[in-house]
């Protein structure tokens, strides 16, 4: 048995299969066919005119504890010659996701649902030109 300190408000760790249940459900939701998954590109981050890097965002008190997040490499976009185009901006595309956060200082198996904004990639947009009136 997991020797987790119990309190009156904590569910019993031995009887609680919460983590396993969540894992099973997420596997079903995330399951992609091999065909679809193999087509998913991993090199867009380098080939894009607004390239980005990925960092491994870790939070042990979050489920999932590992989320890969994008950050734009440049403020500007890269043109065909590989130079930065000062008329075009790189902007981060963000997606709102739901995560489970462990209740701090409480039970290891007690979580709350939270929204999280995650960067998934970058795109190129034209700079806003403000004309002097």
């Amino acid at each position: 048995a997991v020797l987790i300190p119990q309190s009156s408000v904590c569910p019993n760790a031995e009887a609680n299969n919460f983590l396993q249940n969540v894992k099973v459900n997420l596997k079903v939701i995330n399951s992609l066919s091999s065909k679809a998954s193999s087509r998913r590109p991993s090199d867009y981050l380098n080939r894009s005119t607004s390239p980005w890097t990925l960092s491994r965002n870790e939070d042990p008190d979050r489920y999932p504890s590992v989320i890969w997040e994008a950050q734009c490499r440049h403020q500007r976009c890269v043109n065909a010659e590989g130079k930065l185009d000062h008329h075009m901006n790189s902007v981060l595309i963000q997606q709102e996701i739901l995560v489970l956060k462990r209740e701090p200082e409480k039970c290891p198996f007690t979580f709350r649902v939270e929204k999280m904004l995650v960067g998934v990639g970058c795109t190129c947009v034209s700079s806003i030109v403000r004309h002097a009136s």
Epitope: K27, S42, P60, D61
Partner: antibody, heavy 119, light 107 residues
């Protein structure tokens, strides 16, 4: 059946580079992280870094950040670990291991690749 | 980085007896600890994940317990094939770290 098959043993001179491969089969290569771990003779295990073949993201142990490069080739379902500026203390068995990101554990390991650095 | 300290370094036990291996983390790692078995010339083999969950195909004589900083791997009745080196590992935060190992030898 999930399998991780690594390249063969290497002998390198100090200052040289080595590139170890790890070919995955039996599952969708882009779905899980690949971690690299090394074990010096008679020693414990040391984490080098991680690559996610699905998105190309990498993260490194600070001790290896300047010398290790992790890459992945989706067309061949192969992950690579390159270590440069080799020194004698890099002599070790290098393992690739699959990490289940949601579940949070290493389940399958390659058979290991012995890299010997000697002048 | 989080340091994982295993004790004892070597444990001598007779077949059929119980073995208790200890692992301490330098800071709390919740239940994000795994235990691995390694035999000479072989890769590590996962036994326990999340401190107390037995991995698929692992015999019931292996059990894990603990949370926070103190963790234990127990082998209830040692079989000849159980004599090996055992490592604990934390994946609470990177860099992920391993204990130095406990060598379980036949008494």
């Amino acid at each position: 059946e999930v399998q991780l098959v690594q390249s063969g043993a290497e002998v390198k001179k100090p200052g040289a580079s080595v590139k170890v491969s790890c070919k995955a089969s039996g599952y969708t290569f882009t779905d899980y992280e690949f971690h690299w771990v090394r074990q010096a003779p008679g020693q414990g295990l040391e984490w080098i870094g991680v690559i996610h073949p699905g998105n190309g993201g990498t993260a490194y142990n600070q001790n290896f950040r300047d010398r290790a490069t992790l890459t992945a080739d989706k067309s061949t379902s192969t992950a690579y670990m390159e270590l440069s500026s080799l020194r004698s203390e890099d002599t070790a068995v290098y393992y690739c291991t699959r990490f289940l990101t949601y579940e949070g554990y290493f389940d399958y390991w390659g058979q290991g690749t012995l890299v010997t650095v000697s002048s | 980085e989080i340091v994982m300290t295993q004790s004892p370094a070597t444990l001598s036990v007779s077949p059929g007896e119980r073995a208790t291996l200890s692992c301490k983390a330098s800071q709390s790692v919740s239940i994000d600890v795994g235990w691995f078995q390694q035999k000479p010339g072989q890769s590590p083999r996962l036994l326990i994940y999340h401190a107390s969950n037995r991995y698929t195909g692992v015999p019931a004589r292996f059990s894990g317990s603990g949370s926070g900083t103190d963790f234990t791997l127990t082998i209830s009745s040692l079989q000849p094939e159980d004599f090996a080196v055992y490592f604990c590992q934390q994946d609470y935060s990177s860099p992920y770290t391993f204990g130095q190992g406990t060598k379980l030898e036949i008494k």
